[in-house]
């Protein structure tokens, strides 16, 4: 994709000033160079595209280029009265000589350091001049790391040990990532250095700091995140088997979220050695607080559920070491913290949470007064959701968005499942018209119900105080008017009894005569078409 | 470094009880199993009972079923023996004792606790 | 309950000399044995776990063995340190309940 500069085709929608003001500002010649940074590995040549577009009839003699560094200004290289002017970056840049009367103004920067890293901007002056600026990025590979252990023999189950991951001259700074042999990020931990070297090139270092299972896998990579170029290495360490190996117990990190009413999975593993059979297995899931049993199997068989008969582990699976419990038919007071306890040689224990959700209902919106209403009025708008958990968040907005933050009452009341009933009341003045949203969220589910309600008041109703002063105004403008028709009336009855009397005193055809009050007969003409006069 | 601090020394009479406290460091007092055995003077080692505060329940040997309560507080990683209806050959050093983390094995021991009961 | 039982009661031996210490179970307890050595006055000292394993810090004159009912406990050349009461000691699997032996006392003949 190119990136274009000093393009002056803008200015051609817009009127002559701006045109010529455009012109100015800009330079009338379209330098393009590439969107994205250059990529450059350390030791190698780099191309920064730059292009113009030659007007017929142009010769180099007219050519001034120039490449500099932009951010100081510093000179790169230069093309100039006809002729290359050469580099003045360490005689390691160059030009393309026989394409540059075809437009290409690209610069070549052989065996590039970390040091050239930047932008460079390439400035083009014919009759007009133009200039955009293409950056460079410089890169390295990082080495295939070296994993050391500290300490590395006698090593036990328990024994805290560190695990240190080395890989050399990459750049830029790389980002680090350990794991275990399940692919599981281990982040606690974890201390990682960068350390430049005199050519500018990175090496890595990144300490893991690790207790030891009855064995395990420890990968660390590394990644250079502008080759996006990953090196890996890992280190497999097999303990003794010995007093200190405990039962590594796994469940997920994160809160299980069930439904109510649906069936939820309390995620539980460990690592069978070899040679393991049920018999020595000893599992039990208990409420982490109350220590209440929920469910066990010892003995070599399910002993079954301690609690309300809805747990169930999965027989078939144990052997390969998943502990996993089923809890069906969730309720809300199943939420809260489930220990996993594995007893075999050694124990272990882990503990995993069990979030519980249900959705809210779609809002309904109840209106008090809900009739008559009228601009100026204020109304409750009630806004209820029902049967959700946990409890909800609530947020009022208008018709354009905005939040409605004053004025809102909001309650929430748990039902004998414990699941809430939410109702949010929200006091307005009407204006002419508006919709009001409520937006009720759970905040386990990042679920929203939306409902909204839509007033229109009356269109021409005003307050009372108004509607009286309006009536008063209304009564009087008529009498006035009334009484100046009237006068009006009376007026030009006098004259036209005048004007009879006048009339009766002259010989003429009395049938003839027209009084002021009747209109002339059309005339033909067209001028006076349409003509009343009164 | 691992450590287990014992209540000091008891002197009882017959019937009455005696609760000996132990004071667990150096680990996530949670996680180990600990155990509580006596040694009568001139005798054996006895295993009493032991509990895994993670865990919650406590068990007990034979001998000692109904007589022994066995408890711990996680907020303060102590453990506590308590023993009821003391006789005279209860007269013993009481010792709590703890594994690694996550083991059954006993290789941390207390100091121990005489504990004598006479009239 | 399981009960154990350790023989000989006592065992006179002189330094260099090999020592080895039997217990017996009344039924089978896995490989959950472990043997504790106790000098006058200390706490016990876990020397073999599962039967076989020695515990860190512990000499490689001291090596346990057997399974089921039958255990030894063997020191292959004794020095002076060694002359202590040894008790084997197992664990049952569920729930944890541990039985010891009455003991054998190592003395110095």
């Known amino acids: 994709m190119l990136r274009r500069r000093g393009s002056p085709g803008m200015g051609v929608h817009v009127g002559a000033a701006l045109g010529a003001l455009w012109f100015c500002l800009t330079g009338a010649l379209e330098v393009q160079v590439p969107e994205d940074p250059v990529v450059a590995l350390v030791g190698t040549d780099a191309t920064l595209c730059c292009s113009f577009s030659p007007e017929p009839g142009f010769s180099l003699a007219q050519l001034n280029l120039i490449w500099q560094l932009t951010d100081t200004k510093q000179l790169v290289h230069s093309f100039a009265e006809g002729q290359d002017q050469g580099s003045a970056y360490a005689n390691r840049t160059a030009l393309f000589p026989d394409l540059l009367a075809q437009g290409n103004a690209s610069l070549r920067l052989q065996r590039v350091r970390v040091a050239d890293e930047g932008s460079f901007t390439c400035f083009v002056s014919i009759r007009d001049f133009g200039s955009a600026a293409v950056s460079l990025q410089v890169a390295a590979p990082y080495s295939k790391p070296s994993m050391t252990l500290e300490p590395n023999k006698d090593l036990r189950p328990g024994d805290t040990v560190t695990i240190t991951c080395s890989s050399y001259q990459g750049y830029p700074e790389a980002e680090v990532f350990w794991q275990d042999g399940q692919g599981v990020p281990l982040t606690g931990n974890v201390t990682t250095s960068q350390m430049a070297n005199e050519q500018g090139l990175f090496d890595v270092h990144s300490i893991l700091r690790v207790v030891l299972g009855a064995n395990g896998t420890y990968s660390c990579l590394v990644r250079n995140p502008v080759l996006q170029q990953d090196a890996h290495s890992s280190v497999t360490i097999t303990p003794q088997r010995s007093p200190t190996g405990a039962v590594e117990v796994q469940v997920p990190e994160d809160p299980v979220v069930a439904l109510v009413g649906t069936d939820a999975t309390l995620r539980c593993s460990f690592s069978p050695e070899p040679g393991f059979s049920l018999a020595q297995l000893n599992l039990i899931w208990q409420l982490t607080d109350t220590k209440q049993l929920v469910h066990s199997f010892t003995e070599g068989r399910d002993q079954g559920s301690a609690y309300a008969n809805r747990t169930a582990l999965f027989p078939d699976l144990l052997a390969q070491g998943n502990a996993s419990l089923r809890l069906q038919r969730v309720r809300v007071a199943d939420e809260g913290s489930f220990t996993c306890f594995v007893s075999i040689r050694d124990f272990g224990s882990a503990a995993v949470s069990l979030q519980v959700a249900a959705p809210y209902s779609k809002p309904s919106m109840t209106l008090e007064p809900n009739k008559d209403l009228r601009p100026g009025d204020t109304v409750t708008i009630t806004c209820s959701s029902y049967r959700g958990y946990p409890e909800a968040e609530v947020f009022w907005q208008d018709g354009q968005g905005v939040p409605l933050t004053g004025n809102v009452t909001t309650s929430q009341m748990a039902n004998e499942q414990g699941l809430f009933d939410v109702h949010s009341v929200l006091r307005v003045v009407l204006g002419a018209n508006g919709t009001y949203s409520c937006l009720v969220r759970n905040p386990v589910l990042q679920q929203d119900a939306h409902g909204s309600v839509t007033i229109t008041g009356q269109p021409m109703t005003f307050p009372p105080e108004a509607l009286w002063v309006t009536v008063g105004l209304s009564v009087c403008l008529i009498a006035l008017l009334v009484a100046l028709a009237f006068v009006c009336w009376r007026k030009i009855k006098q004259s036209c009894e005048e004007e009879n009397a006048g009339a009766e005193d002259q010989d003429g055809e009395g049938e003839g005569s027209k009084t002021a009050l009747q209109p002339l007969k059309h005339s033909d003409s067209k001028e006076d078409d349409g003509q009343e006069i009164a | 470094e691992v450590q287990l601090v014992q209540s000091g020394a008891e002197v009882k009479k017959p019937g009455s009880s005696v609760k000996v406290s132990c004071k667990a460091s150096g680990g996530t007092f949670s996680s180990y199993a600990i155990s509580w055995v006596r040694q009568a003077p001139g005798q054996g080692l006895e295993w009493m009972g032991g509990i895994i505060p993670i865990f919650g329940t406590a068990n007990y040997a034979q001998k000692f079923q109904g007589r022994v309560t066995i408890t711990a507080d996680e907020s303060t990683s102590t453990a506590y023996m308590e023993l009821s209806s003391l006789r005279s050959e209860d007269t013993a050093v009481y010792y709590c004792?703890?594994?690694?983390?996550?083991?059954?094995?006993?290789?941390?021991w207390g100091q121990g606790t005489l504990v004598t009961v006479s009239a | 309950e399981i009960v154990l039982t350790q023989s000989p009661a006592t065992l006179s031996l002189s330094p260099g000399e090999r020592a080895t210490l039997s217990c017996r179970a009344s039924?089978?307890?896995?490989?959950?044995l472990a043997w504790y050595q106790q000098k006058p006055g200390q706490a016990p000292r876990l020397l073999i776990y599962d039967a076989s394993n020695r515990a860190t810090g512990i000499p490689a004159r001291f090596s346990g063995s057997g399974s089921g009912t039958d255990f030894t406990l063997t020191i292959s050349s004794l020095e002076p340190e060694d002359f202590a009461v040894y008790y084997c000691?197992?664990?049952?699997?569920?729930?944890?309940?541990?039985?010891f032996g009455q003991g054998t006392k190592l003395e110095i003949k």
């Open positions: 004792a703890r594994g690694e983390r996550g083991s059954y094995l006993i290789d941390y």
């Open positions: 000691q197992q664990r049952s699997n569920w729930p944890p309940m541990y039985t």
């Open positions: 039924q089978s307890v896995s490989s959950y």
